[in-house]
């Protein structure tokens, strides 16, 4: 399977909400002992490999934000911890998964990574990730709503191993 990032850049005004999205593509094993671990974290551009560094999002680690389920099953973060930080991660039946960040501030600007791990009976079989940038703007140059910029076809199917 692959992970696609429909948008590579999100430009948002301060105070707005944004939903960053990744999509799981390709055949998904729905075996009894196969599950998927999906999560989000921040990273930085200045590395050899994008997304290799895992930094928290608003003090929440990728473990705090994870979703875990079988196949193309729907799931969302049920714990209060994420919601208290204005965050919610979710996954639908079609392979889309997302993180919603509420009440954006300038400190939220940066590179965000989604990670999908296929787990076959507690063993990591396959890892893929996608990357996108969030720019939070303030002042007269800031847009009134979030503006999203589609990934190039090459970027949108990011299959770099995490």
């Amino acid at each position: 399977f692959k992970v696609a990032t429909p948008y590579s850049l999100y430009v948002c005004p301060e105070g707005q909400n944004v939903t960053l999205t990744c999509r799981l593509l390709g055949p998904v094993d729905k075996g009894h002992d196969v599950t998927f671990y999906k999560t989000w974290y921040r990273s930085s551009r200045g590395e050899v490999q994008t997304c290799s560094e895992r930094r928290p999002i608003r003090n929440l680690t990728f473990q705090d934000l994870h979703l875990h389920h079988g196949g193309h099953q729907a799931a969302n973060t049920s714990h209060d911890l994420a919601q208290r930080h204005g965050l919610e991660s979710a996954s639908d039946h079609h392979g889309n998964f997302s993180i919603t960040m509420r009440n954006l501030t300038l400190l939220d600007s940066g590179l965000y990574c989604c990670l999908v791990v296929e787990i076959r009976h507690h063993h990591s079989e396959h890892r893929v990730h996608g990357a996108m940038e969030l720019q939070v703007q303030t002042g007269k140059d800031a847009p009134s709503n979030c503006v999203v910029y589609p990934s190039s076809s090459q970027d949108s199917e990011n299959i770099t191993a995490a």
Epitope: H32, D33, T35, Y37, L67, H68, H69, G70, Q73, A75, S78, H79, I119, H121, H122, H123, S124
Partner: antibody, heavy 115, light 106 residues
Framework: EVQLLESGGGLVQPGGSLRLSCAAS????????MSWVRQAPGKGLEWVSE???????NYNPSLKSRFTISRDNSKNTLYLQMNSLRAEDTAVYYC?????????WGQGTLVTVSS | QSVLTQPPSASGTPGQRVTISCSRE??????VHWYQQLPGTAPKLLIY???ERASGVPNRFSGSKSGTSASLAISGLRSEDEADYYC?????????FGGGTKLTVL
């Protein structure tokens, strides 16, 4: 906050039966594999059984015929039915959640098999 | 069923670095996980998937795996690290624990 709370332990005579329960909260119970792990007094950890998110069960080969794991996703509860209990089954029984390793553990419930 | 072998005991002084090994003939590509059990408490996941620290675990704890052996390293040893440490892996569909290592902080 993830919480696992075991109950049902106690004193039972050899040959007797006991059913342990584990009430789960703070996460989507039906999406996770769950296991029972036990620890005899002063000894190490021993895996007992697992039930996957889809209901597939696996057992420690030495215990399979006597122990049965089950789950009720509507009640967010994991169970362990233990039959034909022996003195060597005396242990603290822990309920655990599993992704790769066992990332959350209950506080355990003590099962004592003695006449 | 495979067996994970750990040394029964280890020790170190505060500030020191201590390593605990876990060996298995057939460890292959399977992930190894590490747990800490403080006296009188339930075990706690420290390291999963060979080298990933569990949430909230300080970076003094690290895991590695090479060939037939996995290791847990604790740097800057503290008195509160005195505990039993267990490695664990999955052998097909069966979970296996090491016998445990009792770490004493001198």
């Amino acid at each position: 906050e993830v919480q696992l709370l075991e109950s049902g332990g106690g004193l039972v005579q050899p040959g007797g039966s006991l059913r342990l329960s584990c009430a789960a909260s703070g996460f989507t119970f039906s999406n996770y594999a769950m296991s029972w792990v036990r620890q005899a007094p002063g000894k190490g950890l021993e895996w007992v059984s697992e039930i996957s998110h889809s209901g597939t069960t696996n057992y420690n080969p030495s215990l399979k015929s006597r122990f049965t794991i089950s789950r009720d996703n509507s009640k967010n509860t994991l169970y362990l039915q233990m039959n034909s209990l022996r003195a060597e089954d005396t242990a603290v029984y822990y309920c655990t959640r599993a992704i790769w390793g066992f990332d959350y553990w209950g506080q355990g419930t003590l099962v004592t098999v003695s006449s | 069923q495979s067996v994970l072998t750990q040394p029964p005991s280890a020790s170190g002084t505060p500030g020191q670095r201590v390593t605990i090994s876990c060996s298995r003939e057939n460890i292959g590509s399977r992930s190894v996980h590490w747990y800490q059990q403080l006296p009188g408490t339930a075990p706690k996941l420290l390291i999963y998937d060979n080298n990933e620290r569990a949430s909230g675990v300080p970076n003094r704890f690290s895991g590695s795996k090479s060939g037939t052996s996995a290791s847990l390293a604790i740097s800057g040893l503290r008195s509160e690290d005195e505990a039993d440490y267990y490695c664990q892996a999955w052998d097909s569909s069966t979970a296996v624990f090491g016998g445990g290592t009792k770490l004493t902080v001198l």
